[in-house]
């Protein structure tokens, strides 16, 4: 069971990143699915290595003082969502913006029907060029 | 099937990084090989988690305006190369240069005879000290 | 065999990071253990994907000129410790400090009784907020 999906620019104002089965994507079988273009949902309980990579372009003057934060989050059936992993990068002083990349990854127990998704502080800063931003998992 | 190889400084002007089976490297068996010091080639079709880490040292004034970009690339038999993953980091203002590290990783389907390699915008900026720059894969 | 442990602030002045089985941690069975809150120790020989993520907050003026370095290290029975992976990030000019995240990961052969741990140049700069700093492994 494995998946690797590709970032998709979205007109939605939500902080949850959108993904697509496009380009050189992976969706090994129907035991993992991409739901609503925003979350990877698994049918089988078990340990999964889950990862995300986010490239973004920001400028210190044009952004809030808070850093750019990417969060890997879990929504289990009947539970509130929770943060599994986070990474933070202070905005660049480069103009018009400076690119930076964040990588998150870890081993987590998922229940049947559990979904994982990626949240960022400012989706408008995310880079969607080939290979820059992606999200996936594999069952151990 | 798994491999982990270590960066090697190269006098070549190519943007493709060079690797070696040295230090604490891994080469599990002959189903994965390091070819020409530049690419990991697999004999078996299947899903692989492929990763690379690149540490580099650059300075904004001494570099081009474009960021430092590391790309994980795929060359399948009878196909042109393609980008699987990219990460970008804007150059530092630190002098003489500021170190930064990039990590790339994802799950991809590889065909028999497929090769993966790492491309960077400026190989002369890559750090080859112990543990700083490495490349590997594992078959799921 | 898999583990994922969560960073713990420590009053110790050691450069070795401290970890805990808290929050959404993973400890699959007793073939991997967290020893002294500082190292993951495995009972079985084999290939392991080992990873760490460290988020830190630093300022160029308040820090030494040397970059922030995170090292993934190995201590095998009867051997001196050795560096497996390192990542470096130059300090930010943001005030009071600028957050940055480092991710390390690779495939390594571990002997029975081998331990892996994470070393940083300045543990006081490490961010311990939810999900920011973690450490884990999985047996292939």
């Amino acid at each position: 069971i494995a998946a690797h999906v590709i970032s998709e620019a979205s007109s939605k104002t939500t902080s949850v990143l959108q993904w697509a089965e496009k380009g050189y994507y992976t969706m090994s079988n129907n035991l993992v699915t991409l739901e609503n273009g925003k979350q990877l949902t698994v049918k089988r309980q078990g340990l999964y290595y889950i990862y995300a990579q986010v490239t973004f372009c920001s400028n210190r003057e044009a952004s809030s003082q808070a850093p750019f934060i990417a969060s890997l989050c879990l929504k289990s059936p009947g539970r509130f969502e929770r943060i599994l992993l986070r990474a933070a990068n202070t905005h660049s002083s480069a103009k018009p913006c400076g690119q930076q990349s964040i990588h998150l990854g870890g081993v987590f127990e998922l229940q049947p029907g559990a979904s994982v998704f990626v949240n960022v502080t400012d989706p408008s800063q995310v880079s969607h060029g080939t290979g820059f931003t992606s999200f996936g998992l594999l069952k151990l | 099937i798994a491999a982990h190889v270590i960066s090697e400084a190269s006098s070549k002007t190519t943007s493709v990084l060079q690797w070696a089976e040295k230090g604490y490297y891994t080469m599990s068996n002959n189903l994965v090989t390091l070819e020409n010091g530049k690419q990991l080639t697999v004999k078996r079709q299947g899903l692989y988690y492929i990763y690379a880490q690149v540490t580099f040292c650059s300075n904004r004034e001494a570099s081009s305006q474009a960021p430092f970009i590391a790309s994980l690339c795929l060359k399948s038999p009878g196909r042109f190369e393609r980008i699987l993953l990219r990460a970008a980091n804007t150059h530092s203002s630190a002098k003489p240069c500021g170190q930064q590290s990039i990590h790339l990783g994802g799950v991809f389907e590889l065909q028999p005879g497929a090769s993966v390699f790492v491309n960077v915008t400026d190989p002369s900026q890559v750090s080859h000290g112990t543990g700083f720059t490495s490349f590997g894969l594992l078959k799921l | 065999i898999a583990a994922h442990v969560i960073s713990e602030a420590s009053s110790k002045t050691t450069s070795v990071l401290q970890w805990a089985e808290k929050g959404y941690y993973t400890m699959s069975n007793n073939l991997v253990t967290l020893e002294n809150g500082k190292q993951l120790t495995v009972k079985r020989q084999g290939l392991y994907y080992i990873y760490a993520q460290v988020t830190f907050c630093s300022n160029r003026e308040a820090s030494s000129q040397a970059p922030f370095i995170a090292s993934l290290c190995l201590k095998s029975p009867g051997r001196f410790e050795r560096i497996l992976l390192r990542a470096a990030n130059t300090h930010s000019s943001a005030k009071p400090c600028g957050q940055q995240s480092i991710h390390l990961g690779g495939v390594f052969e571990l002997q029975p009784g081998a331990s892996v741990f994470v070393n940083v140049t300045d543990p006081s700069q490490v961010s311990h907020g939810t999900g920011f700093t973690s450490f884990g492994l999985l047996k292939l």
Epitope: T130 | G78, F80, E81, R82 | -
Partner: nanobody, 123 residues
Framework: EVQLLESGGGLVQPGGSLRLSCAAS????????MIWVRQAPGKGLEWVSI????????YYADSVKGRFTISRDNSKNTLYLQMNSLRAEDTAVYYC????????????????WGQGTLVTVSS
Amino acid sequence: EVQLLESGGGLVQPGGSLRLSCAASGFTFMEYAMIWVRQAPGKGLEWVSIISPLGLSTYYADSVKGRFTISRDNSKNTLYLQMNSLRAEDTAVYYCAKYQDSSDSQYTNFDYWGQGTLVTVSS
């Protein structure tokens, strides 16, 4: 909308040099191989040179090997053809084209091309 705009053609003496450029837009340039083709007066299309998506592999027709060099700058979405030691038989309209798929063995497999730039080699 895919657009390819060639420039750099002109009149040059035998043995001279020219550098052609092709500015690309409307597609993800770095994902595609690119090709230069030419059409001499009264003749059919002839492929000249191909460059792979990342510029790591180049291919040349026998008639130009050793004299022409293809290159690309993915950061600028631009394709180039450096033409040295030009001969009268190189006189043609030169077109840049976008390769249609990822197979590296079909040298005529292109789907979009520009309006062309005329190269005349004459004394």
